[in-house]
Interface confidence: low
């Protein structure tokens, strides 16, 4: 689609006749008719395949014609066409007098003609005027014409449509030759495809407009590259969306179930050994002289009756003493100088000599205990209660409150590995999908940490006159070995010299 | 030389229904997309529908979402647009036209269109 211009400059009929040389009264009162049609090479009457536009009286005999465009007015003359341009032409302007006002073809007589050109040839689209004169015998017209393409019209031939737009379709303006320019934030063959915000990431990230970055599902952040973890996801991260991987020692589907409950709440008190034992299950191992799940309570170290044959135990600062009764020596008063025949044994007890009569034994009835038989059965003193259950004594009958962690009558069942706890001298255990793991404290190795790699119990001479000290690694502690003439776990006691006794 | 010739449009009265048809020749008909615009006399043309060269992105202007579907059939070398519940403001010759890529971006050819009338 576009426009043939036509622009009328100058028309010289110096004589004022008509083309058949008869003369104009009172002068040639001039007009044009144009006819643009296909090109042919012998330009000859017929349609004006192309177009026809007629101009009012431009002037008398000679005259030059006004530029008319900037006024809305008829010069240049425009034949618009509806179709791809050739190239080609053929045009044909004649002049006209018009004796009258009326300036119909029919109205007018037929010798009314001054003069007709007929050109034909190639002509491109373009901008530039071609100027061309036609002279006759008595008439002389100059011209200029080109052709333009219609509003949005662009290409060789006016075929290329391109209409600015800014809308679903596109965004983008049309340059000189019909090439799109993308609005800025768009970019794209047809400018659709909108310029996301600078560093949204390609696959996770979009947008609908310029400089935006939508989220697809799954991702989050200013640019999109940070995946969202599964809903519920307590400890945990991902490297693709709705995954949780959990921290270290956290476990459970959502990561919230503590693995290290030992590192994360340091539960035990009073310097005691604290080891997992599964998820957010502990077990404390005490210093001595405290007690208590959490070794949270000081316990008298004579609780634990450690004076035997009837001794009497007295709480000291640095631990305990046992005042031993007639007969009796030694840390524990465990050393007799009784025989049967002091009848040690009480509570119906019978004795038994050993070492030819040095030593004796005493065998005790039912529901009594003790070296002399001299303590009544308390049917919680077996300790019946495995892995730190709590022994209650229920009438004729005992029952075991378990430790978490642990079940079962005695608490002898374990409900995770961990439970009951495997890993020797305070080490640390780890619940394994299969099986579990040891982390040894300093000075202790193995899979369970039995095996003891530096700790020496006899390095800090616990050994009274020149006994020799051994080390006994199964049970972490020392056995001395006295000199003659002396007795006593430490060899502190000399033969022959008991103890006096207050009584 | 790339063709598209319209056919299918007539007068019909408001709430009727009609189907244009698009016969493409001169391309690889499968590699382009399709689309119809329509002018009314002393109106703007307006894109109503197009299509993709596969078929699966498909537009409609608002004015007749809902009311035109576009389709196409590869092995025949056919658009079709059928328009149900038509308007009086439906009135408009019918273009069908390609951009000569797999977008529905641009017009680059288009056919001569069909006069559809739409009047009681």
């Known amino acids: 689609s576009g426009v043939f211009q036509l622009q009328l400059q100058e028309f010289i009929n110096e004589r004022g006749v008509l083309a058949s040389g008869r003369p104009c009264e009172p002068g040639c009162r001039t007009f044009f008719r144009v006819c643009l049609k296909h090109f042919q090479a012998v330009v000859s009457p017929g349609p004006c395949t192309f177009g026809t536009v007629s101009t009012p009286v431009l002037g008398t005999n000679s005259f030059a014609v006004r530029d008319d465009s900037s006024g809305g007015g008829r010069n240049p003359l425009q034949l618009p066409f509806n179709f791809t341009w050739p190239g080609t032409f053929s045009l044909i302007i004649e002049a006209w007098h018009a004796p009258g006002d009326d300036l119909r073809p029919e109205a007018l007589p037929p010798d009314a003609l001054i003069s007709k050109i007929a050109i034909q040839g190639s002509l491109a689209v373009g901008q530039n005027w071609l100027l061309d004169e036609q002279t006759s015998t008595l008439t002389r017209l100059r011209y200029s014409y080109r052709v333009i393409c219609s509003d949005n019209y662009y290409g060789d031939n006016c075929s290329r449509l391109c209409k600015k737009r800014n809308d679903h379709f596109g965004h983008y303006v049309c340059q000189p030759d019909g090439n799109l320019s993308c609005l800025p934030g768009w970019t794209g063959e047809y400018c659709q495809q909108p310029i996301c915000l600078s560093g949204c990431h390609e696959q996770n990230g979009y947008c609908s407009k310029p400089a935006e970055c939508l989220c697809r599902p799954g991702w989050q952040g200013r640019l999109c590259n940070e995946c969202i973890p599964h809903n519920g996801c307590r400890h945990g991260t991902c490297s693709t969306p709705w995954q949780c991987t959990c921290d270290e020692g956290w476990g459970g589907l959502f990561c919230d179930q503590d693995l290290n409950y030992c590192t994360h709440h340091s539960p035990c008190k009073n310097g005691a050994t604290c080891s997992n034992s599964g998820q957010r299950s502990y077990t404390c191992t005490c210093r001595p002289g405290y007690t208590g799940v959490d070794c949270e309570l000081e316990l008298s170290e004579c609780d634990s009756n450690p004076c035997r044959n009837g001794g009497s135990c007295k709480d000291q600062e640095d631990g305990y003493h046992c005042l031993c009764p007639p007969g009796y020596y030694g840390l524990h008063c465990e050393h007799s100088t009784l025989s049967c025949a002091d009848s040690p044994c009480f509570n119906g007890g019978s004795c038994r000599e050993r070492n030819q009569g040095a030593n004796y034994a005493c065998e005790c009835p039912p529901n009594f205990t003790g070296s002399n038989c001299e303590k009544k059965v308390d049917r919680c003193t077996s300790n019946p209660c495995a892995n730190g259950g709590q022994c209650l004594n229920r009438g004729p009958s005992r029952m075991c409150r378990c430790r978490p962690g642990f079940t079962g009558t005695y608490c002898e069942l374990h409900v995770s590995d961990c439970a009951r706890n495997p890993c020797a001298h305070g080490g640390t255990c780890h619940d394994l999908e299969n099986g579990l793991m040891c982390t040894c404290p300093a000075g202790f190795s193995g899979r369970r940490c039995e095996v003891r790699t530096s700790i020496d119990a006899c390095a800090s001479s616990p050994c009274f006159n020149r006994a020799t000290c051994y080390t006994d690694l199964s049970t972490d502690t020392f056995v001395c070995n006295c000199p003659y003439g002396f007795v006593g776990s430490r060899c502190e006691f000399p033969v022959g010299l008991p103890p006096s006794f207050p009584w | 030389e790339v063709q598209l010739v319209e056919s299918g449009g007539g007068f019909v009265q408001p709430g009727g229904s009609l189907r244009l048809s698009c016969a493409a020749s001169g391309f690889t008909f499968d590699d382009y997309a399709i689309g119809w615009f329509r002018q009314a006399p002393g109106k703007e043309p307006e894109e109503i529908s197009c299509?993709?060269?596969?078929?699966?992105?498909?537009y409609y202007a608002d004015s007749v979402k809902g009311r035109f579907t576009i389709s196409r059939d590869n092995a025949k070398n056919t658009v079709y647009l059928q328009m149900n519940s038509l308007k009086p403001e439906d009135t408009a010759v019918y273009y069908c036209?390609?951009?000569?890529?797999?977008?529905?971006?641009?017009?680059?050819?288009w056919g001569q269109g069909t006069q559809v009338t739409v009047s009681s």
């Open positions: 036209a390609t951009p000569g890529i797999a977008a529905c971006r641009g017009i680059h050819y």
């Open positions: 299509i993709s060269s596969s078929g699966g992105i498909t």
